[in-house]
């Protein structure tokens, strides 16, 4: 029987993973800093564009892959080029928390794609 096509992560799964890695955490990835991004300019690709530069941090690899799968979709929310704030760097955990807050809002309002 033919194998299934790739199922994309759902917004709910992304939220669960973001909750999982931020729970009871004061820091992530040894306090690594990343560029702040405007999540309204396509949240998946915008967040990935910043987080792609983080290496040697197993805690966020699953999040990176989820974002990549969602960003890779055609058409997909967030396929638009993101706006990076090149003068503002924040800790990885802050970006992840910002993403969690934003994604939760999108999920509540049912605007998944």
């Amino acid at each position: 029987s033919p194998s299934p096509v790739t199922p994309s992560p759902t917004l709910k799964e992304l939220i669960e993973e973001l909750v999982n890695i931020t729970q009871n955490q004061a820091s992530l990835c040894n306090g690594s800093m990343v560029w702040s991004v405007n999540l309204t300019a396509g949240m998946y690709c915008a967040a990935l564009e910043s987080l792609i530069n983080v290496s040697d941090c197993s805690a966020i690899q699953r999040t990176q892959r989820m974002l990549k799968a969602l960003c890779s979709q055609k058409p997909a929310a967030g396929q638009i080029s993101s706006e990076r704030s090149r003068d503002t760097k924040i800790e990885v955990i802050q970006l992840v928390k910002n993403l969690l807050t934003y994604v939760r809002g999108v999920y509540r309002h049912g605007n998944f794609r």
Epitope: T6, I52, N53, S58, Q61, Q64, R65, K68
Partner: antibody
């Protein structure tokens, strides 16, 4: 030391299926996904997909049109790649690999498994 | 899918010289570009990730540069052990895609 040991060479008939195994050691199996890449004789590298043993999540290269199935057995720290409806164009060395330092950059590779398709 | 165009397809270099391999992507990769080397009969070996970061054990003669869609791998002071086929890999989007490869040999 991370080690990936693959099963031996296979000879299959056209239309058949093949299942290649990749036994791991030296790291926590569920912490990192397992990637599969193939290389036809004298050709380049082609990414087939990955499986995350932690939750079974997969991503497949759609060029394989649903012929690839990736699975993982947490109890034995072994990953599997099954390719169905084999044809001559599937003759290749199949590699399993993991990415630890950078997401999706495969730095630890198995030795490869040659799959031959012949009637 | 993102298409990776690698040039040249083959390269003959004298020992001690510098070899340069180019990789062009069909769309912006941000920094998600890696380089591998494969020697005959062996599995690929990861050399560089995120454009310019060397893996442990990779000599500093190997350096990566570039941004956006254009990337370069430079091998300075080429040695006999540097021969093999070099591949670039984009890991910005799925499916991950490799360049066709550049065969590096010694003159």
């Amino acid at each position: 030391e991370v080690q990936l040991v693959q099963s031996g060479a296979e000879v299959k008939k056209p239309g058949a299926s093949v299942k290649v195994s990749c036994k791991t050691s030296g790291y926590t199996f569920i912490d990192y996904p397992m990637y599969w890449v193939r290389q036809a004789p004298g050709a380049g590298l082609e990414w087939m997909g990955y499986i995350d043993p932690y939750n079974g999540a997969t991503s497949y290269n759609q060029n394989f049109k649903g012929r690839v199935t990736l699975t993982a057995d947490k109890s034995t720290s072994t990953a599997y790649m099954e390719l169905s409806s084999l044809r001559a164009g599937d003759i290749a060395v199949y590699y399993c690999a993991t990415a630890v330092v950078a997401t999706d950059v495969m730095e630890n590779w198995g030795q490869g498994t040659l799959v031959t398709v012949s009637s | 899918d993102i298409v990776m165009t690698q040039t040249p397809l083959s390269l003959s270099v004298s020992p001690g010289e510098t070899a340069s391999i180019s990789c062009k992507a069909s769309q912006n990769l941000r920094n998600a570009l890696a380089w591998f080397r494969q020697k005959p009969g062996q599995s690929p070996q990861a050399l560089i990730y995120l454009v310019s970061n060397r893996y442990p054990g990779v000599p500093d003669r190997f350096s990566g540069s570039g941004s956006g869609t254009d990337f370069t791998l430079r091998i300075s002071r080429v040695e006999a052990e540097d021969t093999g086929v070099y591949y670039c890999l984009q890991h910005w989007q799925y499916p991950l895609t490799f360049g066709a490869g550049t065969k590096v040999e010694l003159k």
